[in-house]
């Protein structure tokens, strides 16, 4: 029950996270014009990964896409790539995790297969979350660097002034959405990996024989050896001697024509 809950919660958290990563990637407000200590301006600039926007004081807003690849900063291209990789991995992870859910039965899929799929989706979510966090962090670092560069330019003298990058940019809403979404996807992935441990079969039982003399007749029982996967408490193989009468586990005592020789 706890495993199902962990897996289900991991799936939901990852789903929310990936939806957030998609939203952040599509948002226009990755960087917004810093209005603090700025002269009064009639426009408010903000930019996303795909287009640049302007809101005039009249309320009129206009956006224009980046219709070039070569003219864009390499860092922006890297951020785009990280976010897209994060989305693709997350989407594949979601697809895999749907089939891995314990509450969904698909044909005669074994628990071991579900465990493997859960682990795979968990790893995908973790990498997806890391990609999103990395992308957002790279962009934030770029903003901070540009902010201080433009601050230095802002306070140059009036004479012969040809100022570039005077408008300073600060963190937009998309950065915070991206950080939170990446974190959620990461947490969801970890939860899926934890659920995978519980989904794996507790023990693998091998039919083994325990030979010992019992008076004049020799008896052996199936199930005398018990091996574990390592997930359960029984981590050591136990050899059971019980005078040929019982095995440790009642369930494994099967009457058979070979019981007495």
């Amino acid at each position: 029950m706890a495993v199902t809950a962990c897996q289900g919660l991991g799936f939901v958290v990852s789903l929310i996270g990936i939806a957030g990563i998609i939203a952040a990637t599509c948002m226009d407000q990755w960087s917004t014009q810093d209005l603090y200590n700025n002269p009064v301006t009639a426009v408010f600039n903000y930019q996303g990964l795909w287009r640049s926007c302007v809101r005039e004081s009249s309320g009129f807003t206009e956006c224009r896409g980046y219709f070039t690849l070569l003219g864009l900063p390499a860092m922006l291209q890297a951020v785009r790539a990280l976010m897209i990789v994060g989305i693709v991995l997350g989407a594949i992870g979601l697809l895999v995790s749907i089939f891995a859910l314990k509450c969904i039965r698909i044909g005669s899929m074994e628990d071991s297969a579900k465990a493997n799929m859960t682990l795979t989706s968990g790893i995908m979510f973790i990498v997806s979350g890391l990609c999103a966090i990395a992308g957002v962090s790279v962009f934030a670092n770029m903003l901070v660097t540009n902010f201080w560069m433009s601050t230095a330019n802002m306070y140059t003298g009036m004479g012969g002034m040809v100022q570039t990058v005077q408008t300073r940019y600060t963190f937009g809403a998309a950065l915070f959405v991206g950080w939170v979404a990446g974190g959620l996807t990461l947490i969801g992935g970890v939860m899926m990996c934890i659920a995978c441990r519980g989904l794996a079969p507790e023990e693998t039982n091998y039919k083994a024989v325990s030979y010992h003399a019992s008076g004049h007749s020799v008896a052996y029982k199936p199930g005398g050896f018990k091996a574990s996967t390592g997930f359960g408490s029984n981590t050591k193989n136990k050899k059971i001697y019980d005078g040929g009468a019982r095995t440790e586990d009642e369930v494994q005592s099967y009457p058979s024509k070979h019981d007495y020789v």
Partner: nanobody, 122 residues
Amino acid sequence: EVQLVESGGGLVQAGGSLRLACAASGRAIGTYDTNWYRQAPGQQREFVAFINYRGGGATYADSVKDRFTISRDNAANTVYLQMNSLKPEDTAIYLCNAHERFPMGRPPYDYWGQGTQVTVTS
């Protein structure tokens, strides 16, 4: 790179008019929004007027509303500021600013002129 040169400033009596021009060279400013700012001695730079790259969206500071008019001629690569009913408090250096409207994934470029002096006497 864009070079901006302001002209049309001078000495004028209160109630008079002046027309300032801001001519751009180096490259066309057809995709740049344009602002006029002014700076009186010992004062902060003050926003005066704005016009977008298409010639619309004109916006003015409250202190100059209904007296100043901003316009542009993209073919001539020039922005104008028509100043009527001038007051002594309008005395300042008037600066032209071209602001890149759609930067490509980086902070927009801002270009500034040297300024032209406007003195209004009473």
